[in-house]
């Protein structure tokens, strides 16, 4: 896949001119090399004071790290010098140049197996593997909700083109090692696992290698189990209502549930003068329940038209799923039509017919 960036292998003490602002230059140096990065002023104009930054932290000059306004030198480079380097205007922090530097174990030129020296600063990708998108490689821990698809990526290059293999907890990882298998996509340098489960937790390592060397990256996968719960009803709904005789009323109930919820609207009634049965369960009549053509949205609203005094009382929204039930209740007060309504029940609303 085209990643839209330039990559170079750089020989010892080669000075690299800075890329245009906004581009990231990918550079590879050998262990022990002198890294030299050059950032000329844009358009050749005055530069002003600058600061060199590595992985977001300002570089402190030392015997090994030589910092100038347009140039950075890191002598005797090692693995730890790999990272994202940028030259910024000190006052505005505007990035003038941006480099991605990787320092390989092998020196960048010299005794390779076929006796040919690597070309110095030729722009040709030769030698040991390196990450082509190092800015994507620093997220080591992935916490993923169960049942989602996970993709680990290790975009790399090298010459000859490296191979990629995957380990789980330090051992070779193959499709037969998990239910549902895995998808290995060598062109995309990726491992895909669909519908992850808790047993997929662990350390996943990509190993990228060719005859010149090997690089690896380890990701830790944590699978988050969604704790199943009964439906959650929005606080304050349904709300108490006060209505005039003959008007229309709506009760609302907002239901949140991972598992498919079943919603019912109930009205509390009296049987032989009692509101509850012998076991303490309230007497209710079902006003609205799921039907073949009823949507969840429709069930979240109970509409009462042309209310009478008999409609006054307690109403309950009952929502259940495979885990359990939740319910919220509200009261309807019906007032005679001739009364002027000055103040409603403080918890409710007034609907004038």
């Amino acid at each position: 896949e085209s990643l839209g960036t330039e990559q170079r292998v750089v020989g010892r003490a080669a000075e690299v001119p800075g890329p245009e602002p906004g581009q990231q230059e990918q550079l590879v140096f050998g262990s022990g090399d002198a890294v030299e990065l050059s950032c000329p002023p844009p358009g050749g104009g005055p530069m002003g004071p600058t600061v060199w930054v590595k992985d977001g932290t300002g570089l402190v000059p030392s015997e090994r790290v030589l910092v100038g306004p347009q140039r950075l030198q890191v002598l005797n480079a090692s693995h730890e010098d790999s990272g994202a380097y940028s030259c910024r205007q000190r006052l505005t922090q505007r990035v003038l140049c941006h480099f991605s530097v990787r320092v390989t174990d092998a020196p960048s030129s010299g005794d390779d197996e076929d006796g040919e020296d690597e070309a110095e600063d030729t722009g040709v990708d030769t030698g040991a593997p390196y990450w082509t998108r190092p800015e994507r490689m620093d997220k080591k821990l992935l916490a993923v909700p169960a049942a989602n698809t996970v993709r680990f990526r290790c975009p790399a290059a090298g010459n000859p083109t490296p191979s990629i293999s995957w380990l789980k907890n330090g051992r070779e990882f193959r499709g037969e090692h998990r239910i549902g298998g895995i998808k290995l996509r060598h062109q995309q340098w990726s491992l895909v696992m669909e519908s992850v489960v808790p047993s997929d937790r662990g350390n996943y390592t990509c190993v990228v290698e060719n005859k010149f060397g090997s690089i690896r990256q380890t990701y830790t996968l944590d699978v988050l189990e969604r704790s199943p719960h009964r439906p959650i009803l929005q606080a304050g709904l349904p709300a108490n209502q006060t209505a005039v005789l003959g008007s229309d009323v709506e009760f609302h109930c907002k239901v949140y549930s991972d598992a498919q919820p079943h919603i019912q609207w109930l009205k509390h009634v009296e049987v032989n003068g009692s509101k509850v049965g012998p076991d303490g369960t309230p007497y209710v009549t079902v006003l609205k329940t799921a039907g073949a053509n009823t949507t969840d949205k429709e069930l979240e609203v109970l509409s009462l038209h042309n209310v009478t005094f008999e409609d006054a009382g307690e109403y309950t929204c009952l929502a259940g799923n495979s885990i359990g039930f939740s319910h919220h209740s509200a009261w309807l007060v019906v007032l005679p039509a001739e009364e002027e309504l000055v103040e409603a029940d403080e918890a409710g609303s007034v609907y004038a017919g």
Partner: antibody, heavy 119, light 107 residues
Framework: EVQLQQSGPELVKPGASVKMSCKAS????????MHWVKQSHGKSLQWIGY????????NYNQNFKDKATLTVNKSSTTAYMELRSLTSEDSAVYYC????????????WGQGTSVTVSS | DIQMTQSPSSLSASLGGKVTITCKAS??????IAWYQHKPGKGPRLLIH???TLQPGIPSRFSGSGSGRDYSFSISNLEPEDIATYYC?????????FGGGTKLEIK
């Protein structure tokens, strides 16, 4: 709750630059790449590029590499996009969006910043 | 870059009905497609990712399917709040591309 709050509308002159912001809250800012997307009036969405807030690394759509510069301020959990040498073609709504770390889709979006380039 | 051809560009449907939108990729995108709902003045809202995985909190009226280069997205039991423009996004490689969008109207 994840939220991305973008800066207000901008009216700028041709040839000028503009810098818009995207303030992130409700999650660890440095753990997720931040993308920027352009929507010209009546047109579809166009990916501009992303920045890794942790290390400052960027990846640009080639069509925008000379137009946009992406930066972040980790301490204020804010991502920025600067557009330079503006023309009428840059008049659009620009969105920031968080990349979901485990698959690469964009799961949360800002409300957009409208940029109008006019003399 | 991978091109995403989305169709239709607009459609009109009745409340309670069902609509289907398709996206065709210029190459195999290995199911890495997401679907978004976009309303004026707001940012796009993720509905579905990895072809058919519903985002938490999104009603099951929304669904997606497909593989290879061909993908579809459906909304059943259409409701008034579904009026919006819908986009597909391929995120198979590190150069993200969107479909042209489908504007949904209610008859």
């Amino acid at each position: 709750e994840v939220q991305l709050q973008q800066s207000g509308p901008e009216l700028v002159k041709p040839g000028a630059s503009v810098k818009m912001s995207c303030k992130a809250s409700g999650y660890t800012f440095t753990d997720y790449n931040m993308h920027w997307v352009k929507q010209s009036h009546g047109k579809s969405l166009q990916w501009i590029g992303y920045i890794n807030p942790n290390n400052g690394g960027t990846n640009y759509n080639q069509n925008f590499k000379d137009k946009a510069t992406l930066t972040v301020n980790k301490s204020s959990t804010t991502a920025y996009m600067e557009l330079r040498s503006l023309t009428s073609e840059d008049s659009a709504v620009y969105y920031c969006a968080r990349e979901r770390d485990y698959d690469g889709s964009m799961d949360f979006w800002g409300q957009g910043t409208s940029v109008t380039v006019s003399s | 870059d991978i091109q995403m051809t989305q169709s239709p560009s607009s459609l009109s449907a009745s409340l309670g009905g069902k609509v289907t939108i398709t996206c065709k990729a210029s190459q195999d995108i290995n199911k890495f497609i997401a679907w978004y709902q976009h309303k004026p003045g707001k940012g796009p809202r993720l509905l579905i990712h990895y072809t058919s995985t519903l985002q938490p909190g999104i009603p099951s009226r929304f669904s997606g399917s497909g593989s290879g280069r061909d993908y579809s997205f459906s909304i059943s039991n259409l409701e008034p709040e579904d009026i919006a423009t819908y986009y597909c996004l391929q995120y198979d490689n590190l150069l993200w591309t969107f479909g042209g969008g489908t504007k949904l109207e209610i008859k």
